[in-house]
């Protein structure tokens, strides 16, 4: 049971969350230099398996990345390296070491002054912008259904506090780029679209900058449109059935239908040896229909108790809406009990139902 | 303007049926679902069930299951909720409410309540 | 089933400010709605995912979910913030809606 394709939940995974990082390491590289960053477990204790992250982003192992449990080198750096490394527990997805990372053009030296005090300038307390929940920030693409609010977020962190940004299609994003507007939240690093359209499609950037650096996101929206349509039954249902006398039968029917479908279960019948009326039309019984207290679920089934040989024949599940209409249909034969077969083979003729 | 508009009070005896309509406007209807909430005098508010107006499919709360029916028709914009063998303890404020989807890119689809129908009492009573 | 704790009544002085709880295990995990409610009236939803106002809804009133505890807080309380606040939040194992008990919010 559920709301539909409009009004369906996707739950969210638990979340152990970690600390903030207390201590955030700043690092000056200079281009071309090999990056090394070690983290240490904790109190000396075992630190179980760990991920290094970039930016938010995973880091693969490469012949310039080399990746340790404790230790992360980045051989023959370049200004793309530079941004916010963690080590994480793969596990809890806790900030075990947070290091700010800046690479910059020139090639670093012993006695390179400005780069020593360009270092000493940043202090521990400062760094470029990072993601404080990038373990939730991998559903890129959203697909919602027209009408509904869609909230993208960027949570991030760093010191001074980064600002945040919004693209559309790599342009800025303003309210009045949209009919209804767009709530900012800066402080819970959100954009907010009430009702959305099917103008709202398109690429959502978040760009999270200070003067140490710049982080962006970009998610993908699809905005679901719905088109109107007769009832959609699934293919083979009902399906054709064989009983024994006297026993019960049941018969299936899914439907699916945008505007609320009216559900009937027809019999063909014969009137006067024809099953057609003169227009072509099939001469029918209706078995059932929505009353009072029945259900789509229930319409969905049609049960045939103690059935005798004059319920065989052909039934038809007919389902319209504002649209139209759609049927599907069954046969049901209708089998003698188990003594009568044996006494007809005995007899040595063989019935047919 | 979104509006929802409930049917009146309704005065029934321990053992009926009572059907509340609420008549959707100022939107497209097929677009929401219906939640039903009741209060009963004094109390807080207590979640029925609700319906799908895009396919009619439905889903009641524990409590109500097999007493409460939730139907749309969706030619009149209108929601329905009826609740069989009406006891003492029904006696509350019915209230239709229009679902909307809230997506969040960090934690995923929620339901909320974002318009409401003007209520309707309904009192058992023998 | 998730189930939600709100105290049943909180006391504010007019100009002070106003701090509703609803808690309930990993509240955080979930995504909170909440509702006032006026004498009389039909509940009027006030804040959604947490922390988002919807139009018409004054800035006084903001929100927060962390852990076990949602919170809404509305700063410099006016009279016309006497009302019953409801957390909702929406059970995704089961598909359903749950409330909290309700809190009454009395403007001394």
């Known amino acids: 049971e559920s709301l539909g394709t409009e009004q369906r939940v996707v739950g969210r995974a638990a979340e152990v969350p970690g600390p903030e990082p207390g201590q955030q390491e700043q690092l000056v590289f200079g281009s071309g230099d090999a990056v090394e960053l070690s983290c240490p477990p904790p109190g000396g204790g075992p630190m179980g398996p760990t991920v290094w992250v970039k930016d938010g982003t995973g880091l693969v192992p490469s012949e310039r990345v080399l990746v340790g449990p404790q230790r992360l080198q980045v051989l023959n750096a370049s200004h793309e390296d530079s941004g916010a490394y963690s080590c994480r527990q793969r596990l809890t997805q806790r900030v075990l070491c947070h290091f700010s990372v800046r690479v910059t053009d020139a090639p670093s030296s012993g006695d390179d002054e400005d780069g020593e005090d360009e270092a000493e300038d940043t202090g521990v307390d400062t760094g470029a912008p990072y993601w404080t929940r990038p373990e939730r920030m991998d559903k890129k693409l959203l697909a919602v259904p027209a009408a509904n609010t869609v909230r993208f977020r960027c949570p991030a962190a760093g010191n001074p506090t980064p600002s945040i940004s919004w693209l559309k299609n790599g342009r800025e994003f303003r309210g009045e780029h949209r009919i209804g507007g767009i709530k900012l939240r800066h402080q819970q690093w959100s954009l907010v679209m009430e009702s959305v359209v099917p103008s709202d499609r398109g690429n959502y950037t978040c760009v999270v900058e200070n003067k140490f650096g710049s982080i962006r996101q970009t998610y993908t929206l699809d905005v679901l449109e719905r088109s109107p349509h007769r009832p959609i039954l699934q293919a083979g249902l009902p399906a054709n059935q064989t009983a024994v006398l006297g026993s019960d039968v049941e018969f299936h029917c899914k439907v699916y239908s945008d505007a609320q479908p009216h559900i009937q279960w027809l019999k063909h019948v014969e009137v006067n040896g024809s099953k057609v009326g003169p227009d072509g039309t099939p001469y029918v019984t209706v078995l059932k229909t929505a009353g009072a207290n029945t259900t789509d679920k229930e319409l969905e089934v049609l049960s045939l108790h103690n059935v005798t040989f004059e319920d065989a024949g052909e039934y038809t599940c007919l389902a319209g809406n504002s649209i139209g209409f759609s049927h599907h249909s069954a046969w049901l034969v209708v089998l003698p009990a188990e003594e009568e077969l044996v006494e007809a083979d005995e007899a040595g003729s063989v019935y047919a139902g | 303007e979104v509006q929802l508009v409930q049917s009146g009070a309704e005065v029934k005896k321990p053992g009926a049926s009572v059907k509340v309509s609420c008549k959707a406007s100022g939107y497209m209807f097929t677009s929401y679902g219906i939640s039903w909430v009741r209060q009963a005098p004094g109390q807080g508010l207590e979640w029925m069930g609700w319906?799908?107006?895009?396919?009619?499919?439905?889903n009641y709360a524990q409590k109500f299951q097999g007493r409460v029916t939730v139907t749309t028709d969706t030619s009149t914009s209108t929601a329905y909720m009826e609740l069989r063998s009406l006891r003492s303890e029904d006696t509350a404020v019915y209230y239709c409410a229009r679902v909307l989807g809230y997506y969040d890119s960090i934690d995923g689809y929620y339901y909320g309540m974002d318009v409401w129908g003007q209520g309707t009492t309904v009192t058992v009573s023998s | 089933q998730s189930v939600l704790t709100q105290p049943p009544s909180l006391s504010v002085a007019p100009g002070k400010t106003a701090t509703f709880t609803c808690g309930g295990n990993n509240i955080g995990d979930k995504s909170v709605h909440w509702y006032r409610q006026k004498p009389g009236q039909a509940p009027v939803l006030v804040m959604y995912l947490d922390t988002e106002r919807p139009s018409g809804i004054p800035e006084r009133m903001s929100g927060s979910n962390f852990g076990n505890t949602a919170t809404l807080t509305i700063t410099r309380v006016e009279a016309e913030d006497e009302a019953d606040y409801y957390c909702?939040?929406?059970?995704?194992?089961?598909?359903?809606?749950?409330f909290g008990g309700g809190t009454k919010l009395t403007v001394l």
């Open positions: 909702q939040v929406w059970d995704s194992g089961s598909d359903h809606v749950v």
């Open positions: 319906v799908s107006t895009y396919n009619g499919d439905t």
